[in-house]
Amino acid sequence: CKAMHVAQPAVVLASSRGIASFVCEYASPGKATEVRVTVLRQADSQVTEVCAATYMMGNELTFLDDSICTGTSSGNQVNLTIQGLRAMDTGLYICKVELMYPPPYYLGIGNGTQIYVIDPEPCPDSDF
């Protein structure tokens, strides 16, 4: 299969609500009409799939119903949002893009975005 460059930010800090967003950009060598995007988490040399979606160019990304990810596409950019993150989810999140159709098939894997998640401090009880 043919290789393709994928770019993503090096570091992202999740919001206090446990939401992190980043852009995954790929250098499409041709005019792909069908794309598959997968987010993988690498931590302690273990790689696990976080979510995956396919989309037709110009349409919304379709994630599984129980996915913690949402996303939109614009040209060769995919805007990804991961929700429900906690401190233990801190890790390297890698964007993988496959151009499924038309042939030839292209595969690109980004260097990863280090997402830092800080659990919010509980509000102290206040005496009135």
């Epitope: 997968t38 993988l40 790689v47």
Partner: nanobody, 119 residues
Framework: EVQLVESGGGVVQPGGSLRLSCAAS????????MGWFRQAPGKEREFVAD????????YYADSVKGRFTISRDPSKNTVYLQMNSLRPEDTALYYC????????????WGQGTLVTVSS
């Protein structure tokens, strides 16, 4: 060294069926994904189908959706491609491929098995 060996190719009439097999040997097989690609003479290599082994989730190219089925038998380290309602345009060399991890890419490839659909 991991080896992938395909079998099951042959000549079949339009509308017929074939079942391709891909057996992995020579290593440990906690593959992230296994898939099938094909290449017709003078054409680019094309994605056909894959299965992501942890979730058992399958994905198909539009051109084969509803006609081809990918499955696996972990106990035999084997992945299958059941091909029904074959068409002349399905004629190609079919390759099995394996992804050791989600970020490795398709590191392992078989030698291919030829499928010819002709009356």
């Amino acid at each position: 060294e991991v080896q992938l060996v395909e079998s099951g190719g042959g000549v079949v009439q339009p509308g017929g069926s074939l079942r391709l097999s891909c057996a992995a040997s020579g290593g440990t097989f906690s593959f992230y994904g296994m898939g099938w690609f094909r290449q017709a003479p003078g054409k680019e290599r094309e994605f056909v189908a894959d299965i992501r082994t942890s979730a058992g989730r399958t994905y198909y190219a539009d051109s084969v959706k509803g006609r081809f089925t990918i499955s696996r038998d972990p106990s035999k380290n084997t992945v299958y491609l059941q091909m029904n309602s074959l068409r002349p345009e399905d004629t190609a060399l079919y390759y099995c491929a394996a992804e050791p991890s989600g970020i490795s890419g398709w590191d392992y490839w078989g030698q291919g098995t030829l499928v010819t659909v002709s009356s």
